[in-house]
């Protein structure tokens, strides 16, 4: 599911925000490592947060951490383990409007 | 509007099997995580089952693993419960639930079914 | 699993009072916490989501907040159709597990 919506009614011309690919839904194995991807491109550069289970996602040491990218951002969970399961979203802003992905990760 | 509605509940001996099935309607069941989860007489919630059935993934409680099978079928959007080599704990209401569509709590429940362990 | 510890276990209040129900999880949960309502013979109803958003169509009486670790369900000013058993539940991490329950009596 992908959404967007304004904040402000009066946005600049030259202000944009675009999500460019819905993000990944991913089926894996235990121990394994999986990435979701969230591909926004923004002006200015959007802030992006990530969310699992419609909660503020827990980075953790070498296992659960999340970056900036040149696409956006990825979120990386390494030795993946059963209680990983849920929705993962991304929520990108650029000050004036946001848009959210949502992926599955099973 | 969603709905859930449980059925195949009853009594049955030690060691027998029953089949639970949870109608759904209202919303694109294969885009949900469905559950099934359980309250003994005078008891609180116990969490029992899960499945995606656009990943055909499932999940299970560590008391109900190796006997319980929870399964799908996406042309009657319907989630089962298959219940194996049943014990007198395992006597409870037994609800559906569906998650909310970005993950966490449990939106719509079903009414229920109860399923009686006893010789 | 991620245990959940509720109090109290049984609350007597009159109608009008404040209450307050805790729960705490054994790790962190992030702010995954839902608040449940359910009536003898009913099927739960979800209250709160995500620790303090108000689900759709339930009255602004019922509010959830966070500290940490710690969640509280706060119901404004009780009221008749309140006397019920209420349930919290992480959900960030699978499986999703629930506190023992508060059973809310009249006084």
């Known amino acids: 599911p992908t959404s967007s919506w304004n904040i402000s009614s009066e946005l600049n011309k030259d202000s944009y925000l675009t999500l460019d690919e819905p993000m990944n839904n991913i089926t894996t194995s235990l121990g394994q490592t999986a990435e979701l991807h969230c591909k926004v491109s923004g002006n200015p550069p959007p802030t992006i947060r990530w969310f699992k289970n419609d909660a503020p996602v827990v980075q953790e040491p070498r296992r659960l951490s999340f970056r900036s990218t040149i696409y956006g951002s990825r979120l990386r969970i390494r030795n993946l383990d059963t209680t990983d399961t849920g929705y993962f979203q991304c929520v990108a802003t650029n000050g004036k409007e946001v848009v959210s992905s949502t992926g599955v990760l099973f | 509007e969603v709905q859930l509605v449980e059925s195949g509940g009853g009594l049955v001996q030690p060691g027998g099997s029953l089949r639970l099935s949870c109608a759904a309607s209202?919303?694109?069941?294969?885009?949900?995580?469905i559950h099934w989860v359980r309250q003994a007489p005078g008891k609180g919630l116990e969490w029992v089952a899960t499945?995606?059935?656009?990943?055909?993934?499932?999940s299970y409680a560590d008391s109900v693993k190796g006997r319980f099978t929870i399964s799908a079928d996406t042309s009657k959007n319907t989630a089962y419960l298959q219940m194996n080599s049943l014990r007198a704990e395992d006597t409870a209401v037994y609800y559906c639930?569906?998650?909310?569509?970005?993950?966490?709590?449990?939106?719509?429940w079903g009414q229920g079914t109860l399923v009686t362990v006893s010789s | 699993d991620i245990q959940m510890t509720q109090s109290p276990s049984s609350l007597s209040a009159s109608v009008g009072d404040r209450v307050t129900i805790t729960c705490r999880a054994s790790?962190?949960?992030?702010?995954?916490v839902a608040w449940y309502q359910q009536k003898p013979g009913k099927a739960p109803k979800l209250l709160i989501y995500?620790?303090?958003s108000l689900y759709s169509g339930v009255p602004s009486r019922f509010s959830g907040s966070r500290s940490g670790t710690d969640f509280t369900l706060t119901i404004s000013s009780l009221q008749p159709e309140d006397f019920a058993t209420y349930y919290c539940?992480?959900?960030?991490?699978?499986?999703?597990?629930f506190g023992q329950g508060t059973k809310v009596e009249i006084k």
């Open positions: 209202g919303f694109t069941f294969s885009s949900y995580f």
């Open positions: 995500s620790a303090s």
């Open positions: 539940q992480q959900a960030y991490w699978s499986p999703a597990t």
């Open positions: 499945i995606h059935s656009y990943f055909d993934g499932t």
């Open positions: 790790q962190s949960v992030s702010s995954a």
């Open positions: 639930a569906r998650t909310r569509p970005t993950g966490g709590a449990f939106d719509y």
